[in-house]
Interface confidence: low
């Protein structure tokens, strides 16, 4: 017999075709012979069959010898066999029904785990493999678990149940919450406005909850909050700022800082964490302010940046249409007795520039 | 929420075949019907025809022969293939999906139509 | 093929009308009769399935009524938002047609 997998909730076409392309006599029955549907004179009739509210045939069909039954809206306890009779024969059709859902709420935050539970029909022996939106796979039998989701796990997930060598596949959507970006780095001019923007790896129709930047200085002992907030279907509002610095807040998402003068005594390394209503963790973004001074003393240049800078950028002190002067892999680099011109500071990262300060020296006579 | 979308040439030179793709996306296209249906500008719908994932088709007798359709479920797209057009083929085609249910069969999910003219 | 004829192929109605248009069947066909509306540039939009189920989502000021070859399809109330070309479609056997149509439009 035929052996047809259908998917809990969804439709699924049973087919018997005649050998005779005509409107002819036919039945479909359970294994229970109840009567499910049939053809009297040019009609639909409908038996008693527990189906029967959500069986129906292809009326359209009937003049080209096909006879299929429809059933909608899927449940596990429809695998069955059926029969339809038709022109003197029985056809069967074994259907299995399955179904494949997630244990909990399928917004799920970074580093939570996923459960899959496949739901089957009694005597199945089906097997399930899954693969993330990333290409990642994950086989198992009636449940499939994800241990700790990444970023990249969010998407559509597709999982294939596999029995009698025959598939259906399922389309579970995932949310994982998080930021796009787990840290960021700013860098910035002393004396510049800092723009920080937390964008959301994922969008919710309501989005609801609090949130908090705490800032940890360089030149500071320990960190402090500074700034709380709250947010309320996409709508930002702030609860607590410190005096100083006084952050700016955007009101709308994405969530967006604004500090209006960067200044040496603020770089360092914050970490912005939202917690949203109804779920448990929060999310997190790590930011990184570095800030840049470059100052004429008397006879000394000096460039000097501060905050957290990885230890292989490049601080170069350089004359305008000329090579570098001086380069360290320092937080400081100086010239004595500067020539006159247009001297540069820049940070760099192999080659790349990350920050530039410019600084004019003038001829001392 | 399951969205359509036409794609192919919009210009087919007259004895060609023209060819258009339907895309599926927010959903699955196996178990259901999906339709082709056109509408010349000012004028009617035309039924075209229908596939399924079974590759099970009906063609309106009036196109049966010049039409082809065929379906992709691992692509979950479904294709129209119409031979020997000429200036009376040049129509808006849009994709639908065929929804059936109990006391219930509708295109109810319609691509936004594809324009195509048939010129030389 | 079944033929559907609609009637009228245009009419002119004012806001807050009661507006009634026909669709007759070739032949006998049970209730297998679909009713939808399509504005100008757009695919168009089920809205009466089954001669006179209204499809989720549809104002009820729509309804359909009729069996076998004669249907009616009605706005209680015109709005608008209503100025259209609504077609009635058959779907008791194939091929699926179509009626020819009916633009409607706002005095």
């Known amino acids: 017999k035929k052996v047809v997998l259908g998917k809990k909730g969804d439709t699924v076409e049973l087919t018997c075709n005649a050998s005779q392309k005509k409107n002819t006599q036919f039945h479909w029955k359970n294994s229970n012979q109840i009567k499910i549907l049939g053809i009297q004179g040019l009609f639909l009739t409908k038996g008693p069959s527990k189906l029967s509210d959500r069986a129906d045939s292809r009326k359209s069909l009937w003049d080209q010898g096909c006879f299929s039954m429809i059933i909608k809206n899927l449940k596990i306890e429809d695998s069955d066999t059926y029969i339809c009779e038709v022109e003197n024969k029985k056809e069967e059709v074994e259907l299995l029904v399955f179904g494949l859902t997630a244990n909990s709420d399928t917004h799920l935050l970074e580093g939570q785990s996923l459960t899959l539970t496949l739901e089957s029909p009694p005597g199945s022996s089906p097997s399930v493999k899954c693969r993330s939106p990333g290409g990642k796979n994950i086989q198992g039998g009636r449940t499939i678990s994800v241990p700790q989701l990444e970023r990249q796990d969010s998407g559509t997930w597709t999982c294939t149940v596999s029995q009698d060598q025959k598939t259906v596949e399922f389309k579970i959507d995932i949310v994982v919450l998080a930021f796009q970006k787990a840290s960021s780095t700013v860098y910035k001019k002393e004396g510049e406005q800092v723009e920080f923007s937390f964008p959301l790896a994922f969008t919710l129709e309501k989005l609801t909850g609090s949130g908090e930047l705490w800032w940890q200085a360089e030149r500071a002992s320990s960190s402090k909050s500074w700034i709380t907030f709250d947010l309320k279907n996409k709508e930002v509002s702030v609860k607590r700022v410190t005096q100083d610095p006084k952050l700016q807040m955007g009101k709308k998402l994405p969530l967006h800082l604004t500090l209006p003068q960067a200044l040496p005594q603020y770089a360092g390394s914050g970490n912005l964490t939202l917690a949203l209503e109804a779920k448990t963790g929060k999310l997190h973004q790590e930011v990184n302010l570095v800030v840049m001074r470059a100052t004429q003393f008397q006879e000394n240049l000096t460039c000097e940046v501060w905050g957290p800078t990885s230890p292989k950028l490049t601080l170069s002190l350089k004359l305008e249409n000329k090579g570098a002067t001086v380069s360290k892999q320092a937080k400081a680099v100086w010239v004595l007795n500067p020539e006159a011109g247009m001297w540069q500071c820049l940070l760099s990262d192999s080659g790349q520039v990350l920050l530039e300060s410019n600084i004019k020296v003038v001829p001392t006579w | 929420q399951v969205q359509l979308q036409e794609s192919g040439p919009g210009l087919v030179k007259p004895s060609e075949t023209l060819s258009l793709t339907c895309s599926v996306s927010g959903g699955s296209i196996s178990t259901y019907y999906w339709s082709w249906i056109r509408q010349p500008a000012g004028k009617g719908l035309e039924w075209i025809g229908r596939i399924c994932t079974t590759e099970n088709t009906n063609y309106n007798p009036s196109l049966k022969s010049r039409v082809t359709m065929s379906i992709d479920s691992s692509k979950n797209q479904f294709s129209l293939k119409l031979s020997s057009v000429t200036a009376a083929d040049t129509a808006v085609y849009y994709c639908?999906?065929?929804?059936?249910?109990?006391?219930?069969?509708?295109?109810?999910?319609w691509g936004q139509g594809a324009t195509v003219t048939v010129s030389s | 093929d079944i033929q559907m004829t609609q009637s009228p192929s245009s009419l002119s109605a004012s806001v807050g009308d009661r507006v009634t248009i026909t669709c007759q069947a070739s032949?006998?066909?049970?209730?297998?009769l679909n009713w939808y509306q399509q504005k100008p540039g757009i695919a168009p939009k089920l809205l009466i399935y089954?001669?006179?189920n209204l499809e989720t989502g549809v104002p009820s000021r729509f309804s359909g009524s009729g069996s076998g070859t004669d249907f009616t399809f009605t706005i209680s109330s015109l709005q608008p938002e209503d100025i259209a070309t609504y077609y009635c479609?058959?779907?008791?056997?194939?091929?699926?047609?179509f009626g020819q149509g009916t633009r409607l439009e706002i005095k």
């Open positions: 479609q058959q779907y008791d056997s194939l091929p699926i047609t």
């Open positions: 032949q006998d066909i049970s209730n297998y």
């Open positions: 089954d001669a006179s």
């Open positions: 639908a999906r065929d929804l059936e249910r109990l006391n219930y069969y509708g295109m109810d999910v």
